[in-house]
């Protein structure tokens, strides 16, 4: 009879065990365990009748189609085998054990005691059939196994082979290389690869297989397993396989599809191809005169681009437009996108006008082309070129006039200062009292007329000032403050100020330049009580043209000591000699009560201590500060007076050979102007040089050399 066993383990004994088994007996045990397991069988006791080749009694172990072992006897001999310690393993999940005894037993035999169990099959170790084994990685587990793939691969639906996803490859460059996946390693199985070459219309794709070509093939049937097919429009080339690469292919198309198919077996290295775009050829190019073409090639094809540039000093000229470079392209029909432009010599064109300067051409015919040269110069003697620049400019390759120092910036013509068009009188003899100034003797002298309409009735007064540049007047702060409130410093509005320059005789203003004020700047620390910091600036609405009667005075170097005692200086003004004259009379042109003609006086600088003592001895709170100096004579007789306020006290500077403004007429008194031991007090300008430059928006170094040459 047959016993069916389905457990994962169990025990099998001969009939009657442990007693002797009966004669003429046959029992079959069929053991079935789940897939992924095999059966292990071993015997703990075995005692059967011995016979040649186990003809009488035996235990036979088999599978469906194979006898695994036949046992009989008590111990193993040449012709019979006992299991002993031997273990019987089934190849699969089924094992059949048959016990048979014949009709006679000469002795009493106890039979057998056997045990079985299901044991795991390690499929990863034992699968040698390529059709069943994992393509890449195998993972065993109790009762089964599974396959996985390397990075970049996908497990096929057969759960065994590894394929790649390679159906979405687009190539748009004009040249490229395409290979089978993982080339030159064996390509993946079960894969469908699609490569699209899509170029711009006008190109034609040429294919060339290179290096190794190894695709699984068949001796009789053309490419049944793996293959390449090339699809050009409706036409299909291939299939291609084996070890011989196809010949180069000229597709005559800008769009090509390459199909690569692999089945689930085989180990072949694959393929590699390069593709190249071919286009129509364009005619040969000639570079322009004074120019070049880049890149320089023997032949140019569709989509090739060339850059036309010119030699230094020349510009590309295309359709009357100047440019640095010009690009043209070979079109799909084999023509160039544009004609080759010409190279035209760079033209810097007419140089920029120089304020207060002139231009002379060094090159014949007043040429303004590349490498031409011009020279700027200033309108001497009224202006001088800043930093003694050469003024030479060359037409550069960039089309701009360039100076070695200034680059493309124009030079600056600065007003010459402190050099009257007629020389001031010698300082040998002392002048008692004032004298008429010749025209052009004090070209920096400014008449400042103020009409303050912010008060009712309007206030009118005047003072003097000194021209520092074409746009700035230096004066005393008290001239430019509102007069009506004696203890407050309120600057007059710029609208209320008129400046006259080049004025000699106040009765004849026709030859003078009159200018409105753009800004009125009083020193922020001006003190109305003691006239400390009595200095101010007026910026003119428009720069004034310089000439023999209008020229700036020089500013001093920054010297806290100020002018040395006993130095002689000159001061000019239209100040009134008659103290009872009114402003209305001063400003009306017909008056004889003020000095119609500009007056000047020569005065020595008074030692500071002497002046201080002179004022301290008076009743009243007079203060001669370090920002002031005094000038005049002990015996009196000559002095500055009302209306001279803000005028420049100038001293000739031997070093620079120029007249320098050292003082500004500030205050004096309380006695009448020119009284004995009443020195005129002047603002010490050298203490304010930095402040002045700052207000004028010029770095000191710009103008300083003019004084110190």
């Amino acid at each position: 009879h047959t016993v069916e066993l389905n457990n994962m383990f169990g025990q099998i004994q001969s009939p009657g065990y442990p007693d002797s088994y009966p004669s003429d007996s046959e029992v079959t045990w069929n053991i079935t365990v789940p897939d992924g397991f095999r059966i292990k069988l071993y015997f703990m006791h075995f005692n059967l009748e011995s016979s040649y080749l186990c003809e009488y009694d035996y235990v036979k172990v088999e599978t469906e189609d194979q006898v695994l072992a036949t046992f009989c006897g008590r111990e193993t001999t040449d012709t019979e085998q006992t299991p002993g310690q031997e273990v019987v393993l089934s190849p699969g999940s089924f094992m059949s054990i048959t016990f048979r005894s014949d009709f006679s037993n000469e002795e009493r035999f106890t039979g057998f005691d056997a045990h079985y169990m299901a044991v795991d099959v390690d499929e990863c170790k034992e699968r040698e059939d390529e059709e069943l084994s994992c393509d890449h990685y195998c993972h065993n587990y109790i009762g089964g196994y599974y396959c996985s793939c390397r990075f970049g691969y996908i497990l096929h639906t057969d759960n065994r082979t590894c394929r790649v996803e390679c159906s979405d490859n687009l190539f748009t460059q004009r040249t490229g290389v395409i290979t089978s996946p993982d080339f030159p390693n064996p390509y993946p199985k079960s894969s469908e690869c699609l490569y699209t070459i899509e170029l711009e219309e006008g190109f034609m794709v040429n294919l060339q297989f290179e290096d190794i070509f190894d695709i699984e093939d068949h001796p009789e049937v053309p490419c049944p397993y793996d293959y390449i097919k090339i699809k050009v429009g409706p036409k299909v080339l291939g299939p291609f396989c084996g070890e011989k690469a196809p010949e180069p292919i000229s597709t005559q198309s800008h769009s090509v599809l390459i199909l690569f198919h692999s089945d689930n077996s085989g180990e072949n290295r694959g393929w590699r191809l390069s593709y190249r775009a071919a286009g129509n050829e364009c005619p040969e190019l000639q570079p322009p005169v004074h120019g070049k073409i880049e890149p320089s090639q023997a032949k140019y094809f569709f989509k090739d681009q060339v850059l036309v540039s010119c030699d230094t000093g020349y510009k590309v000229l295309k359709d009357n437009v100047e440019m640095d470079t010009f690009q043209i392209e070979c079109l799909k029909d084999g023509t160039w996108s544009n004609k080759i432009p010409t190279c035209k010599i760079v033209d810097c064109r007419a140089p920029g006008e120089l304020e207060h300067g002139l231009i002379t051409f060094s090159t014949r015919n007043n040429l303004t082309t590349y490498k031409s040269e011009i020279k700027y110069s200033c309108q001497e003697p009224y202006y001088k070129m800043l930093n003694n620049n050469t003024g030479i400019y060359t037409c550069s390759a960039q089309g701009v006039w360039m100076n070695k120092v200034l680059g493309r910036s124009l030079p600056t013509c600065l007003p010459e200062c402190g050099q009257p068009s007629r020389s001031l009188p010698s300082l040998v003899k002392r002048i008692i009292g004032g004298r008429n100034a010749e025209p052009g003797l004090f070209p920096w002298q400014a008449l400042i007329v103020v009409e303050d309409t912010s008060r009712v009735p309007n206030d009118k007064w005047f003072g003097s000032g000194a021209l520092l540049s074409a746009s700035w007047i230096l004066t005393a702060a008290h001239v430019l403050r509102s007069q009506r409130r004696d203890t407050t410093v309120i600057p007059v509005s710029k609208e209320h100020v008129t400046v006259y320059l080049g004025l000699h005789d106040v009765r004849d203003k026709s030859g003078a330049v009159n200018s409105s004020a753009a800004r009125v700047v009083l020193h922020p620390d001006f003190n109305i009580q003691n006239y400390n910091h009595d200095i101010a600036l007026v910026q003119l609405q428009e720069p004034v043209p310089l000439g023999p009667h209008v020229m700036p005075v020089c500013l001093p170097r920054l010297e806290p000591e100020g002018p040395a005692p006993h130095m002689l200086g000159l001061v000019a003004g239209w100040g009134i000699s008659n103290p009872n004259v009114t402003v209305d009379e001063i400003i009306s042109s017909g008056t004889r009560t003020l000095s119609d003609v500009l007056q000047y006086v020569k005065l020595p600088v008074v030692p500071h201590a002497e002046c201080k003592t002179s004022y301290e001895s008076r009743s009243g709170n007079y203060s001669v500060t370090e920002n002031m100096f005094c000038a005049g004579y002990y015996e009196g007789g000559k002095d500055t007076c009302l209306g001279d306020s803000g005028g420049a006290f100038v001293i000739f500077d031997d070093l620079s050979q120029r007249w320098v403004v050292q003082g500004l007429v500030s205050w004096g008194g309380p006695e009448e102007c020119g009284s004995k031991q009443v020195y005129g007090v002047y603002t010490k300008v050298s203490n304010y040089v930095d402040w002045v430059w700052e207000q004028m928006g010029l770095p000191q170094s710009v103008v300083e050399p003019q004084v110190e040459r």
């Epitope: 912010s454 008060r455 009712v456 009735p457 206030d459 007069q483 309120i490 509005s493 004259v581």
Partner: antibody, heavy 113, light 112 residues
Framework: QVQLVQSGAEVKKPGASVKVSCKAS????????IEWVRQAPGQGLEWIGE????????NYNEKFKGRATFTADSSTSTAYMELSSLRSEDTAVYYC??????WGQGTLVTVSS | DIVMTQSPDSLAVSLGERATINCKSS????????????LAWYQQKPGQPPKLLIY???TRESGVPDRFSGSGSGTDFTLTISSLQAEDVAVYYC????????FGQGTKVEIK
């Protein structure tokens, strides 16, 4: 012709503030100083201060510094005087005048608890 | 501050007679730059704002009758009504604007 029109009378409690307005017409408002003067009942004239509307420049009588504030609105040609921390002795008629010549009609400010 | 002192405090004058008011300042009101004395005279009638009569010590404001005149310089100034009229009854103030302005205490002019 030049005219200055002031705001109406005010009654204020001690410690409060008052703001008097002065609207100008007939001339360029920004270009002339506006002065403020007061006159206590039966008393003389006392100068408070001034403002130049175009620039905002001000001058104050020391006595009123910190208590009086002058402002001007060029768009409406109106000057303002604000007096704070009022006390009974501030009861007066307050006048604005264009620099020295033209006066407003006056604004009576009464300070009473 | 500059102190302005008027004299007399009040004045009774017959119609058509001369009236003289004095004003003294504690410091000079002459600005040497503009050569102006910054002194003005005002007339105030009851219930009205003051009215400008004289500026710069001696210049008559337009529209002011010529019986009103001003004189003086430095620290001493005078307002003269050459022939008093009934409409001239008022309080007269001097004002200096040389510095932060100050007024005189006022002079009351009445008809005798």
């Amino acid at each position: 012709q030049v005219q200055l029109v002031q705001s109406g009378a005010e009654v204020k409690k001690p410690g409060a503030s008052v703001k008097v307005s002065c609207k100008a017409s007939g001339y360029t408002f920004t270009g002339k100083w506006i002065e403020w003067v007061r006159q206590a009942p039966g008393q003389g004239l006392e100068w408070i201060g001034e403002i130049l509307p175009g620039t905002g420049s001000t001058n104050y009588n020391e006595k009123f510094k910190g208590r009086a504030t002058f402002t001007a609105d060029s768009s409406t040609s109106t000057a303002y005087m604000e007096l704070s921390s009022l006390r009974s002795e501030d009861t007066a008629v307050y006048y604005c005048l264009r620099s020295e010549d033209v006066w407003g009609q006056g604004t009576l400010v009464t300070v009473s608890s | 501050d500059i102190v302005m002192t008027q004299s007399p405090d009040s004045l009774a004058v017959s119609l058509g007679e001369r009236a003289t008011i004095n004003c003294k300042s504690s410091q000079s009101l002459l600005n040497t730059r503009t050569r102006k004395n910054y002194l003005a005279w005002y007339q105030q009638k009851p219930g009205q704002p003051p009215k400008l009569l004289i500026y710069w010590a001696s210049t008559r404001e337009s529209g002011v009758p010529d019986r009103f005149s001003g004189s003086g310089s430095g620290t001493d100034f005078t307002l003269t009504i050459s022939s008093l009229q009934a409409e001239d009854v008022a309080v007269y103030y001097c004002k200096q604007s040389y510095n932060i302005p100050t007024f005189g205490q006022g002079t009351k002019v009445e008809i005798k």
